[in-house]
């Protein structure tokens, strides 16, 4: 069985839908990004206990590694987080979803290392240019997601202090050659391009020279286009709620989507005494969906007024776009009014929350 080879580039804090079982989803993140992997239950049925595994070893939750039954979040990703991730059923170890994650060096903002490699008097009487930090110039190919900032650096020295100029694909490169311009930081021997786009792909050459000689280094930039993805829902929303009979309740859902999302609020219901259809998928009714005059902001909140015991149950925020769907659910527990609780306590009854 061949593995899927689609290269999916995911922007910051992007939740990645789980691939079909048997397919390996190949994902690229920038360092510092939040890696979010999502593995919905196959067939929509109950998932059972799951474990997340990286390179064959079970992942241990921490402040940076957040593990849930259907989702894994790795905050502030670094190169060490690259590897093969899978979500498995705990008992059978059956692989439900499989991801290949690569964390690329996120280019710096262009400002965070200012002053590090400024031209210095090396004490050499005279001499041709040379690289002062060649170990920092090893990475000749840079692949970054679109909209990131790229910084190429060629720290050098010589006497007299050499000049630096830049070429793109062998031709002189100036700010007017790209939308958004460029920043040339001669003191830091750097070229900075903000918010890169696919047309920025190419070979970038720094030329460092003085009257005694010339050296050059070429970097290749590949700009990875963000592939469209299904909507992303903010973790933890909607949140479970407990309310007293007759009170008002609000569920919140925060949706991020490149393509225009279609948001719905669903209530899980019973039909003929069953919570699921013949095929095991939960019965739902649509409580709220987009209207001609409804804003996305309004749709991100479900308000329930004067709640009754019938309002208790499971609610789902469902967001869909042309690519697919994402959903998060929460429970509403409705408690009797306080005076009823008091009466019940006096009668010796016990309520389990």
């Amino acid at each position: 069985e061949s593995l899927g080879t689609e290269q999916r580039v995911v922007g910051r804090a992007a939740e990645v839908p789980g691939p079909e079982p048997g397919q390996q989803e190949q994902l690229v993140f920038g360092s510092g990004d939040a890696v979010e992997l999502s593995c919905p239950p196959p067939g929509g049925g109950p998932m059972g206990p799951t474990v997340w595994v990286k390179d064959g070893t079970g992942l241990v939750p921490s402040e940076r590694v957040l593990v849930g039954p259907q989702r894994l979040q790795v905050l502030n990703a670094s190169h060490e987080d690259s590897g093969a991730y899978s979500c498995r059923q705990r008992l059978t170890q059956r692989v439900l979803c499989h991801f290949s994650v690569r964390v690329t060096d996120a280019p710096s903002s262009g400002d965070d290392e200012d002053g590090e490699d400024e031209a210095e008097d090396t004490g050499v009487d005279t001499g041709a240019p040379y690289w002062t930090r060649p170990e920092r110039m090893d990475k000749k190919l840079l692949a970054v997601p679109a909209a990131n900032t790229v910084r190429f650096r060629c720290p050098a020295a010589g006497n007299p202090t050499p000049s630096i100029s830049w070429l793109k694909n062998g031709r002189e490169f100036r700010g007017e050659h790209r939308i958004g311009g460029i920043k040339l930081r001669h003191q830091q021997w750097s070229l900075v391009m903000e918010s890169v786009v696919p047309s920025d792909r190419g070979n970038y050459t720094c030329v460092v020279e003085n009257k005694f000689g010339s050296i050059r280094q070429t970097y290749t930039l590949d700009v990875l286009e963000r592939s469209p993805h299904r909507p992303i829902l903010q973790a933890g929303l909607p949140a479970n709620q407990t309310a007293v009979l007759g009170s008002d309740v609000e569920f919140h859902c925060k949706v991020y989507s490149d393509a225009q999302p279609h948001i719905q609020w669903l209530k899980h219901v019973e039909v003929n005494g069953s919570k699921v259809g013949p095929d095991g998928t939960p019965y739902v009714t649509v409580l709220k969906t987009a209207g001609a005059n409804t804003t996305d902001k309004e749709l991100e909140v479900l308000s329930l007024h004067n709640v009754t015991f019938e309002d208790a149950g499971e609610y789902t925020c469902l967001a869909g776009n042309s690519i697919g769907f994402s959903h998060h659910s929460a429970w509403l527990v409705v408690l009797p009014a306080e005076e009823e609780l008091v009466e019940a306590d006096e009668a010796g009854s016990v309520y389990a929350g």
């Epitope: 013949p278 019965y283 009714t285 969906t289 209207g291």
Partner: antibody, heavy 126, light 110 residues
Framework: QVQLVQSGAEVKKPGASVKVSCKAS????????MHWVRQAPGQGLEWMGW????????NYAQKFQGRVTMTRDTSISTAYMELSSLRSEDTAVYYC???????????????????WGQGTLVTVSS | DIALTQPASVSGSPGQSITISCTGT?????????VSWYQQHPGKAPKLMIY???NRPSGVSNRFSGSKSGNTASLTISGLQAEDEADYYC??????????FGGGTKLTVL
């Protein structure tokens, strides 16, 4: 973009069966319900039923119960509709239509058809 | 067995506005805000024009609008154009969660 491509026209004899295919592309096949709707010559649209490509679950209109079978092959993103015991009044254009129903749920009274196949003409004639 | 009632035909001149009605019961149109409308040109597949009573999919002209009052949904086309000439169908649900269509309305642009 989303595309539903149906199989070609069929001519069948009364009593025979016909199987129409609908190949989906441009979206995640298992995320949306697939419906079948038919239209007899000069008549209106008639809903036949749906299949949930994710679970394989089906729901058929009362009129077609016992005669229609909807199946899918997720490996090739294709849905199928088979109608048996054909009679002349089954002569119609048969459409597959993607329903805006998320396939992880069974909806009560909700959804619409946001993409349609080009239609397959099935002629039943002796 | 058509569950929703539409006029068999309506007509209008270019630039005019026309309205097509779709009448059901409290078990279908009246019970849910989930009526949709489809346009069908001769020999072509239907095309979604309005969903959830009044929403337009992207790519559909804002000359098309939908509304609902009680058990009757309506499709209004303003600034009528020759290419609007087609059949129009409404769609909703019945209490068995079955999809129901209207009988269709033939729109003629004079």
């Amino acid at each position: 973009q989303v595309q539903l491509v149906q199989s070609g026209a069929e001519v069948k004899k009364p009593g025979a069966s016909v199987k129409v295919s609908c190949k989906a592309s441009g979206y995640t096949f298992t995320s949306y319900y697939m419906h079948w709707v038919r239209q007899a010559p000069g008549q209106g649209l008639e809903w036949m039923g749906w299949i949930n490509p994710n679970s394989g679950g089906t729901n058929y209109a009362q009129k077609f119960q016992g005669r229609v079978t909807m199946t899918r092959d997720t490996s090739i993103s294709t849905a199928y509709m088979e109608l048996s015991s054909l009679r002349s009044e089954d002569t119609a254009v048969y459409y597959c239509a993607r329903g805006y129903w998320y396939a992880y749920f069974t909806y009560i009274n909700y959804g619409y058809f946001d993409n349609w196949g080009q239609g397959t003409l099935v002629t039943v004639s002796s | 067995d058509i569950a929703l009632t539409q006029p068999a035909s309506v007509s209008g001149s270019p630039g005019q506005s026309i309205t097509i009605s779709c009448t059901g019961t409290s078990s279908d149109v009246g019970g849910y805000n989930y009526v949709s409308w489809y346009q069908q040109h001769p020999g072509k597949a239907p095309k979604l024009m309005i969903y959830d009573v009044s929403n337009r999919p992207s790519g559909v002209s804002n000359r098309f609008s939908g509304s609902k009052s009680g058990n009757t949904a309506s499709l209004t086309i303003s600034g009528l154009q020759a290419e609007d000439e087609a059949d129009y169908y409404c769609q909703s649900y019945d209490n068995n969660s079955d999809v129901v269509f209207g009988g269709g309305t033939k729109l003629t642009v004079l």
